[in-house]
């Protein structure tokens, strides 16, 4: 299963960030977004968004904090390889 492409983190504020990515139409049933403060373990947050979406706003983030985010495409119950990025609020 090919991964989504071109993950961009934009509009970063002290407590939010916009994720956007590309994928062929109807390539995935949904996208799984996982993010966590980079310096912590056991804190990963998992979100699912519809396969028709190509952006998502992360909210409730902590100011001045580095985050690691990964996005996976999901099709027929199978998960693609991830596309990952690191950003700081």
């Amino acid at each position: 299963l090919p991964a989504p492409k071109n993950l961009v983190v934009s509009e970063v504020t002290e407590d939010s960030a916009r994720l956007s990515w590309t994928a062929p139409d109807a390539a995935f049933d949904s996208f799984l977004i996982q993010y966590q403060e980079s310096e912590k373990v056991g804190e990963a947050i998992v979100l699912t968004v519809p396969g028709s979406e190509r952006s998502y706003d992360l909210t409730g983030l902590k100011p001045g904090t580095e985050y690691t985010v990964s996005i996976y495409g999901v099709k027929g119950g199978h998960r693609s390889n991830p596309l990952s990025a690191i950003f700081t609020t």
Epitope: V41, T68, A85
Partner: antibody, heavy 117, light 112 residues
Framework: QVTLKESGPGILQPSQTLSLTCSFS??????????VGWIRQPSGKGLEWLAH???????GYNPALKSRLTISKNTSSNLVFLKIASVDTADTATYYC?????????WGQGTSVTVSS | NIMMTQSPSSLAVSAGEKVTMNCKSS????????????LAWYQQKPGQSPKLLIY???TRESGVPDRFTGSGSGTDFILTISNVQAEDLAVYYC????????FGSGTKLEIK
């Protein structure tokens, strides 16, 4: 040299609040990326994570026990505390505190707690 | 919650043999730009507290003999002990530390 040592009441009665203390040395909870957690193990059984606290005072709790747990710290004294409210016999276990830094890398020797009427 | 399933629950081998034990997570514990598996293995000898052997699924903790090897990725992991010694008598737990913290129920290693 990193060390952690747990202390507790030993024995307490059902419905009481269990208060545990973790005293540690060899690291600081002022250091970014560092946390301390609590794990318990009933005799002859497996390991169960209870709670953890980070250098920045973020806390995490086992969802099944969250309503009964309170974790806190005294950074300057190198102490972490865990309170478990309304204990019953199912809370009888050995309680361990652990350092978390990228992984749970150092464990205390454990303190045995018995809940009995 | 991510559930961790270990197998077998116990096994017995003779000293000098090689042993493998399995751990399966209910969802992938692979995460991040560096593609790390948030999976550790612990050894708990009778009457002692657990000791970290392996983290990031395959990185040996300092001081751990190289006969302990961790492998696997995603949801399926293996701990291999080559040339088993009498002092390896213990229960071995796998543990995920990606989303909260959960442990497997353990594999008890006995020496024949």
């Amino acid at each position: 040299q990193v060390t952690l040592k747990e202390s507790g009441p030993g024995i307490l009665q059902p419905s009481q609040t269990l208060s545990l203390t973790c005293s540690f040395s060899g690291f600081s909870l002022n250091t970014s990326g560092t946390g301390v957690g609590w794990i318990r193990q009933p005799s002859g059984k497996g390991l169960e994570w209870l709670a953890h606290i980070w250098w920045d005072d973020d806390k995490g709790y086992n969802p099944a026990l969250k309503s009964r747990l309170t974790i806190s710290k005294n950074t300057s004294s190198n102490l972490v505390f865990l309170k478990i409210a309304s204990v019953d016999t199912a809370d009888t276990a050995t309680y361990y505190c652990v350092r978390i830094k990228g992984r749970m890398d150092y464990w205390g020797q454990g303190t045995s707690v018995t809940v009995s009427s | 919650n991510i559930m961790m399933t270990q197998s077998p629950s116990s096994l017995a081998v003779s000293a000098g043999e090689k042993v493998t034990m399995n751990c399966k997570s209910s969802q992938s514990v692979l995460f991040g730009s560096k593609q790390k598996n948030y999976l550790a293995w612990y050894q708990q000898k009778p009457g002692q507290s657990p000791k970290l052997l392996i983290y990031w699924a395959s990185t040996r903790e300092s001081g751990v003999p190289d006969r302990f090897t961790g492998s696997g990725s995603g949801t399926d992991f293996i701990l291999t002990i080559s040339n088993v010694q009498a002092e390896d008598l213990a229960v071995y737990y796998c543990h995920q530390y990606l989303s909260l913290f959960t442990f497997g129920s353990g594999t008890k290693l006995e020496i024949k």
